[in-house]
């Protein structure tokens, strides 16, 4: 009879064991274990009748199609075999054990005691068959195994071979190299690779297989396993396989598909090809005169680009447009996209106008081309060049006039200061009551007219000032303070200020320059009670042109002592001291109660202590501060207070040979102007030099040399 056994282990004994087995007996045990296991069988006891080739009694171990062993007897002999310590292993998951005894037993035989167990199959070690073994990696586990792939590979649906995903390769460059996956290592199995070469229309792809060509083939059938096919439009070239590479292929197309197929077996190294775009050839190029073309090649094909550039000092000229470089391209029809441009010498064109300056050409014919030279100079004697610049500019390769120091910036013509077009008279003798000033004697003298239209009737008053530069007037703060009804210090509105320069005779304004104010700046510490810090600036709306009758005065050096006692200075003014004279009358026809023509006087600086004492002795709260100095004569006289408020008290500076504004007409009194010991009080300008430069937005060092030369 047959016994079916399905357990993972078990025991099999001869019938009646441990007693002797009966005669004429046959039992079959069919052992089945799960797939992935084999059966291990061994005997703990074995005692059967001996016979030649185990013809009588035996134990036969077999699989479905194979006898694994036949045992009988007690000891192994030449013709019979006992299991002894031997282990029987089934190749698969099934084992059949048959026990048979014949009709007679001469002795009493005890039979056998056997054990079996399911043991794991290590498929990774034992699979010899390529059709079944893992392509890359094999992993055993109890009862089975699985395969995996190297990085970049994908396990095929057969769970054994490793393929690659290679159906999405696009090549758009004009040249390139394409290989089978993992080249030169064997290419993956079970793969469908697609390579697309897609170039711009006008190019044609040429293919060339290189190096190794090794694709699995067949001796009789053309490329049944692995192959390359090349698809050009509707046309298919190939299949190609084996060890001989195809000849170079000229596809005559800008679009090519390469298909590579591999089946699930074989170990071949694959292939490598290079492709190159071919295009129409364009005609040879000649570089322009004074120029070059890059890159320089013997031949140029479709899509080649050439950059045309010119030598230093020349510019590319194309269709009357100047440029640094020009690019042309070889077109698909074998023509160039443009004609070669010409190289034209750089032209800096007419140099920029220099305010208050002149230009002279150093090059003949007033040339303005590359390397030409010009020289800027200032309108002397009214202006001089800042930092004593050479003024020489050369036409650069960039097409701009360049100076070694200033680069492309133009030089600056600074107004010369303190140098009247007429020499001021000798300061030896005193001028009683003032005298007429010749035109150009006080070219810095400004008449400041303030018309406050915020009151009804409009309030008008005037003062004098001194020109410091083409755009700035220095004056006294009290002239430009809004005549508010309280004691606040607020500047007048700039719209209410008019400045007259170059004015000599108030009846004749035709030669004068009148300018509006862009800014009115009072000294922040001006004190309305005692006139301390009585200094202010007016910035003109437009710079005034300098000339013989309009020139700035120089600022002094920063020196707290101010002008030395007994030094002689000059003050100019129209002597407008009559309170009944209106500004309208001053600016229009003039009136006989004042001088139509600018007057000036010579006054000595009064020692500070003497002046302080003279004012302290008076009734009233007079304060002569360190920001003031006095000038005038002890015995008085009209000349002492001829100057108009804000006018400049100038002293000749021997060092620089220029006239310097040391004071501004500020106050005096309370007695009648010109009374004995009534000195005029002036703002000490040397205390405010830094403040003035700061307001004018110029560093002191820039202009200082005007005075210290």
């Amino acid at each position: 009879h047959t016994v079916e056994l399905n357990n993972m282990f078990g025991q099999i004994q001869s019938p009646g064991y441990p007693d002797s087995y009966p005669s004429d007996s046959e039992v079959t045990w069919n052992i089945t274990v799960p797939d992935g296991f084999r059966i291990k069988l061994y005997f703990m006891h074995f005692n059967l009748e001996s016979s030649y080739l185990c013809e009588y009694d035996y134990v036969k171990v077999e699989t479905e199609d194979q006898v694994l062993a036949t045992f009988c007897g007690r000891e192994t002999t030449d013709t019979e075999q006992t299991p002894g310590q031997e282990v029987v292993l089934s190749p698969g998951s099934f084992m059949s054990i048959t026990f048979r005894s014949d009709f007679s037993n001469e002795e009493r035989f005890t039979g056998f005691d056997a054990h079996y167990m399911a043991v794991d199959v290590d498929e990774c070690k034992e699979r010899e068959d390529e059709e079944l073994s893992c392509d890359h990696y094999c992993h055993n586990y109890i009862g089975g195994y699985y395969c995996s792939c190297r990085f970049g590979y994908i396990l095929h649906t057969d769970n054994r071979t490793c393929r690659v995903e290679c159906s999405d390769n696009l090549f758009t460059q004009r040249t390139g190299v394409i290989t089978s996956p993992d080249f030169p290592n064997p290419y993956p199995k079970s793969s469908e690779c697609l390579y697309t070469i897609e170039l711009e229309e006008g190019f044609m792809v040429n293919l060339q297989f290189e190096d190794i060509f090794d694709i699995e083939d067949h001796p009789e059938v053309p490329c049944p396993y692995d192959y390359i096919k090349i698809k050009v439009g509707p046309k298919v070239l190939g299949p190609f396989c084996g060890e001989k590479a195809p000849e170079p292929i000229s596809t005559q197309s800008h679009s090519v598909l390469i298909l590579f197929h591999s089946d699930n077996s074989g170990e071949n190294r694959g292939w490598r090809l290079s492709y190159r775009a071919a295009g129409n050839e364009c005609p040879e190029l000649q570089p322009p005169v004074h120029g070059k073309i890059e890159p320089s090649q013997a031949k140029y094909f479709f899509k080649d680009q050439v950059l045309v550039s010119c030598d230093t000092g020349y510019k590319v000229l194309k269709d009357n447009v100047e440029m640094d470089t020009f690019q042309i391209e070889c077109l698909k029809d074998g023509t160039w996209s443009n004609k070669i441009p010409t190289c034209k010498i750089v032209d800096c064109r007419a140099p920029g106008e220099l305010e208050h300056g002149l230009i002279t050409f150093s090059t003949r014919n007033n040339l303005t081309t590359y390397k030409s030279e010009i020289k800027y100079s200032c309108q002397e004697p009214y202006y001089k060049m800042l930092n004593n610049n050479t003024g020489i500019y050369t036409c650069s390769a960039q097409g701009v006039w360049m100076n070694k120091v200033l680069g492309r910036s133009l030089p600056t013509c600074l107004p010369e200061c303190g140098q009247p077009s007429r020499s001021l008279p000798s300061l030896v003798k005193r001028i009683i009551g003032g005298r007429n000033a010749e035109p150009g004697l006080f070219p810095w003298q400004a008449l400041i007219v303030v018309e406050d239209t915020s009151r009804v009737p409009n309030d008008k008053w005037f003062g004098s000032g001194a020109l410091l530069s083409a755009s700035w007037i220095l004056t006294a703060a009290h002239v430009l303070r809004s005549q508010r009804r309280d004691t606040t210090v607020i500047p007048v509105s700039k719209e209410h200020v008019t400045v007259y320069l170059g004015l000599h005779d108030v009846r004749d304004k035709s030669g004068a320059v009148n300018s509006s104010a862009a800014r009115v700046v009072l000294h922040p510490d001006f004190n309305i009670q005692n006139y301390n810090h009585d200094i202010a600036l007016v910035q003109l709306q437009e710079p005034v042109p300098l000339g013989p009758h309009v020139m700035p005065v120089c600022l002094p050096r920063l020196e707290p002592e101010g002008p030395a006692p007994h030094m002689l200075g000059l003050v100019a003014g129209w002597g407008i001291s009559n309170p009944n004279v209106t500004v309208d009358e001053i600016i229009s026809s003039g009136t006989r109660t004042l001088s139509d023509v600018l007057q000036y006087v010579k006054l000595p600086v009064v020692p500070h202590a003497e002046c302080k004492t003279s004012y302290e002795s008076r009734s009233g709260n007079y304060s002569v501060t360190e920001n003031m100095f006095c000038a005038g004569y002890y015995e008085g006289g009209k000349d002492t207070c001829l100057g108009d408020s804000g006018g400049a008290f100038v002293i000749f500076d021997d060092l620089s040979q220029r006239w310097v504004v040391q004071g501004l007409v500020s106050w005096g009194g309370p007695e009648e102007c010109g009374s004995k010991q009534v000195y005029g009080v002036y703002t000490k300008v040397s205390n405010y030099v830094d403040w003035v430069w700061e307001q004018m937005g110029l560093p002191q060092s820039v202009v200082e040399p005007q005075v210290e030369r």
Epitope: T453, S454, R455, V456, P457, D459, K460, W461, G463, H478, V479, R481, Q483, R485, D486, T487, I490, P579, V581, S645, W667, G669
Partner: antibody, heavy 113, light 112 residues
């Protein structure tokens, strides 16, 4: 023509505030000072203060500094004077004046409990 | 504050006669910068706002009859009506605007 037109008469309780308006026409409002002057019944003139509409600058009589506020709306060419913490002695006709020459018709403010 | 003292308080003058009103300031009204004296004279008739007659001590406002004149300097000022007319009956005020303005107490002019 050039004129200043003031708002109508007001009756206020002590401690309240009053705001008098003055609409200018016929000239550039922003460029001229507007003064405020008052006159108590049967009394003389008293200067309260002034405003320059274009800049908003103001000057106040020290006596009114804490109670009077001047403002100006340049879009409507109107000046305003607000007087707070009113008392019976503030009963007066309040005038707005363009600088010194042109006077409004006056606004009577009566302060009474 | 500058104090303005007007005299007399009232004045009765015959038609066609001269009327003189005085005004004294507690300090000089001459501005040394503008060289102007900031004193004005006003006329106020009953139920009307004041009217500007004279500014800068002596300058007559346009449209004001020339019988009105102003004089004086420093601290002493005078308004003169050279020939009094019936329509000149009013209260007259002086005003300084050298600093924050102040008015005089007023002078009532009547016909005798």
């Amino acid at each position: 023509q050039v004129q200043l037109v003031q708002s109508g008469a007001e009756v206020k309780k002590p401690g309240a505030s009053v705001k008098v308006s003055c609409k200018a026409s016929g000239y550039t409002f922003t460029g001229k000072w507007i003064e405020w002057v008052r006159q108590a019944p049967g009394q003389g003139l008293e200067w309260i203060g002034e405003i320059l509409p274009g800049s908003g600058s103001t000057d106040y009589n020290e006596r009114f500094k804490d109670r009077a506020t001047f403002t100006a709306d340049t879009s409507t060419s109107t000046a305003y004077m607000e007087l707070s913490s009113l008392r019976s002695e503030d009963t007066a006709v309040y005038y707005c004046v363009r600088s010194e020459d042109l006077w409004g018709q006056g606004t009577l403010v009566t302060v009474s409990s | 504050d500058i104090v303005m003292t007007q005299s007399p308080d009232s004045l009765a003058v015959s038609l066609g006669e001269r009327a003189t009103i005085n005004c004294k300031s507690s300090q000089s009204l001459l501005n040394s910068v503008t060289r102007k004296t900031y004193l004005a004279w006003y006329q106020q008739k009953p139920g009307q706002p004041p009217k500007l007659l004279i500014y800068w001590a002596s300058t007559r406002e346009s449209g004001v009859p020339d019988r009105f004149s102003g004089s004086g300097s420093g601290t002493d000022f005078t308004l003169t009506i050279s020939s009094l007319q019936a329509e000149d009956v009013a209260v007259y005020y002086c005003k300084q605007s050298y600093t924050l303005p102040t008015f005089g107490g007023g002078t009532k002019v009547e016909i005798k």
